[in-house]
């Protein structure tokens, strides 16, 4: 018995060859002897039933002269999985057709961190093995159900699943979209008084995007977190529902999600969590955003540089006179110089020599007041 593997929705060609290598009478039947189609000597294809019933079945007339009488089944269905009989030259050829399908669990658009389940639809009696390769080249192998937990952004793209049955292969391609923000976390460094821009770009594009979101903010100086803004998303249009009065936030009306804080102030320094709930999706998308604010001041004979917000312990805060070595450099959130000499002083926040934030303050001779450019 010949085995042919097919993919649901596609076409399969079931072979039937004559030893004569020339046109001859042939008939294709179901295993219960119902006739599908055939050729009875006049070179005309005769179907075994009404056109509507048999419109998916065909043969290759061009191959008949070469002694080949294939049965073509179009738009394959799972229930086409059965034994087909080709009768020619007083013999019967049995061809077993197994139709397979690989589906993703409920949806091909999944939230980051969710699980992807790939299910092989297979006919009874088949004993397939499946191997699926993710877009980043990771292979998973198993029986009729394969699961990948904790989907990552790199899992977005085309998954290729190979079904192996009796040394024959059939390949499926499934496009998976992992719904996530481009960055899980971001940090913004600003001098006091500067305008702050927060951006939350999505790592996917879809026709229509509907949902709702909220930004909760935990200021370093505050004892509890506070909802800064809530908004709706309708077909990629953003509409603000509720916004805090302090700070006076503004939100862009289009994607990517974009927030503007008019002034960076020490009392706003801290961490925020933007949550986006998408329509018809269980679970939410999250992006963390952090704000670090720097202030340089001179009070009487003390020049001070301070930062507020979530800084890592390895960050270095320095005070230096322009074009000179740092006067003070510490892994602290505040540094100061007593009786600073006149000139342009720089306050620098750096990470392994790379400057993240810089604030300049001009120290005038002792008889005048300081100038902050």
């Amino acid at each position: 018995k010949t085995l042919v593997l097919g993919k649901e929705g596609e076409s399969a060609e079931l072979p039937c060859e004559s030893s004569q290598k020339k046109i001859t009478v042939f008939t294709w039947k179901f295993s219960d002897q119902r006739k599908i189609l055939g050729q009875h000597g006049k070179g005309v294809l005769i179907r075994g039933g009404s056109p509507s019933q048999f419109d998916r079945f065909d043969s290759k007339k061009g191959a008949w002269e070469k002694g080949s009488f294939p049965l073509i089944i179009n738009k394959l269905k799972m229930e086409d999985s059965q034994t087909y009989i080709c009768e020619l030259e007083n013999r019967k050829e049995e061809v077993e057709l197994w139709v397979f399908k690989v589906t993703a669990n409920s949806d091909t658009h999944l939230l980051q961190g969710q699980s992807l389940t790939l299910t092989l639809e297979s006919p009874p009696g088949s004993s397939p093995s499946v191997q699926c390769r993710s877009p980043r080249g990771k292979n998973i192998q198993g029986g009729k159900t394969l699961s990948v937990s904790q989907l990552e952004l790199q899992d977005s793209g085309t998954w290729t699943c190979t079904v192996l049955q009796n040394q024959k292969k059939v390949e499926f391609k499934i496009d998976i979209v992992v719904l996530a923000f481009q960055k899980a976390s971001s940090i913004v460094y600003k001098k006091e008084g500067e305008q702050v821009e927060f951006s939350f770009p999505l790592a996917f594009t879809v026709e229509k995007l509907t949902g709702s979101g909220e930004l909760w903010w935990q200021a370093e100086r505050a004892s509890s977190s506070k909802s800064w803004i809530t908004f709706d998303l309708k077909n990629k249009e953003v509409s603000v529902k509720r916004v805090t009065q302090d700070p006076k936030l503004q939100m862009g009306k289009k994607l990517p999600l974009h927030l503007t804080l008019p002034q960076a102030l020490p009392q706003y320094a801290g961490s925020g969590n933007l949550t986006l709930a998408l329509e018809a999706k269980t679970g939410k998308l999250h992006q963390e955003v952090n704000l670090v604010v720097m202030r340089a001041t001179q009070l009487q004979k003390n020049l001070t540089c301070e930062v507020w917000g979530p800084t890592s312990p390895k960050l270095m805060l320095s005070l230096k006179l322009e074009n000179k070595e740092a006067k003070v450099s510490k892994r602290e959130k505040a540094v100061w110089v007593l009786n600073p000499e006149a000139g342009m002083w720089q306050c620098l926040l750096s990470d392994s020599g790379q400057v993240l934030l810089e604030s300049n303050i001009k120290v005038l001779p002792t008889w005048s007041t300081p100038v902050q450019p």
């Epitope: 018995k1 799972m78 999985s81 059965q82 034994t83 077993e96 399908k101 589906t103 669990n105 389940t117 299910t119 639809e121 297979s122 006919p123 009874p124 009696g125 088949s126 004993s127 397939p128 093995s129 192998q141 198993g142 029986g143 009729k144 159900t145 699961s147 192996l164």
Partner: antibody
Framework: QVQLVESGGGLVKPGGSLRLSCSAS????????MNWIRQAPGKGLEWVSY????????FYTDSVKGRFTISRDNAKNSLYLQMNSLRAEDTAVYYC??????????????????WGKGTTVTVSS | EIVMTQSPAALSVSPGERATLSCRAS??????FAWYQQKPGQAPRLLIY???TRATSIPARFSGSGSGTEFTLTISSLQSEDFAVYYC?????????FGQGTKLEIK
């Protein structure tokens, strides 16, 4: 532990309907293909229907085609068999059974490893 | 549809003795073949799958052999709990079919 419990059987008149349920526990139901198998009184076993883990692929034995409908609800860990136009010859104990598999040298072997205790359906006037 | 024929229909054997049950398929089913044991009022219990692989927690006295169309279940030394009805079944293609059963009785 792995368990399948059938319910919904009973006495019904010819032409009537019944809905059998099978409640699964102790395993990830949504990962497994499921089956209904029946056994007429004092007779042998007969396969009735087969459903894939997602519920997309379904097969029936010829004698029940068009009358019986197999379905599943993975969220509820439940398998169902809706039986319409019942006949006297449908009288049997109906078993719910799980399709298991083993893997040997990357070859997969499928078999029916876990069965419920069965529920009795009697079709009589 | 593949027809499974079991022989004998009934078999009387004394405890401690060997029992051999046969099953023939009307066409080749490769090794997609299983044996089940059923006791009165109970569901069938899988003994052997893939023609020769013992299912979990099945004693070593049960063994299966054969391929294609001829299959054998051997119980090397019968215990009192082994007296039951035994069914063979193929799972080569749809519909899966069972044999009519062999009743193993105490002699």
């Amino acid at each position: 532990q792995v368990q399948l419990v059938e319910s919904g059987g009973g006495l019904v008149k010819p032409g009537g309907s019944l809905r059998l349920s099978c409640s699964a526990s102790g395993f990830t139901f949504s990962d497994y293909y499921m089956n209904w198998i029946r056994q007429a009184p004092g007779k042998g076993l007969e396969w009735v229907s087969y459903i894939s883990s997602s519920g997309i692929t379904i097969f029936y034995t010829d004698s029940v085609k068009g009358r019986f409908t197999i379905s599943r609800d993975n969220a509820k860990n439940s398998l169902y068999l809706q039986m319409n136009s019942l006949r006297a010859e449908d009288t049997a104990v109906y078993y719910c059974a799980r399709e298991d598999y083993s893997n040997y040298e990357d070859h997969y072997y499928y078999y029916t490893g876990v069965w419920g205790k069965g529920t009795t359906v009697t079709v009589s006037s | 549809e593949i027809v499974m024929t079991q022989s004998p229909a009934a078999l009387s054997v004394s405890p401690g003795e060997r029992a051999t049950l046969s099953c023939r398929a009307s066409q080749s089913v490769s090794n997609k073949f299983a044996w089940y044991q059923q006791k009165p009022g109970q569901a069938p219990r899988l003994l052997i799958y893939n023609a020769s692989t013992r299912a979990t927690s099945i004693p070593a006295r049960f063994s299966g052999s054969g391929s294609g169309t001829e299959f054998t279940l051997t119980i090397s030394s019968l215990q009192s709990e082994d007296f039951a009805v035994y069914y063979c079944q193929h799972y080569n293609n749809w519909p899966y079919t069972f044999g009519q059963g062999t009743k193993l009785e105490i002699k």
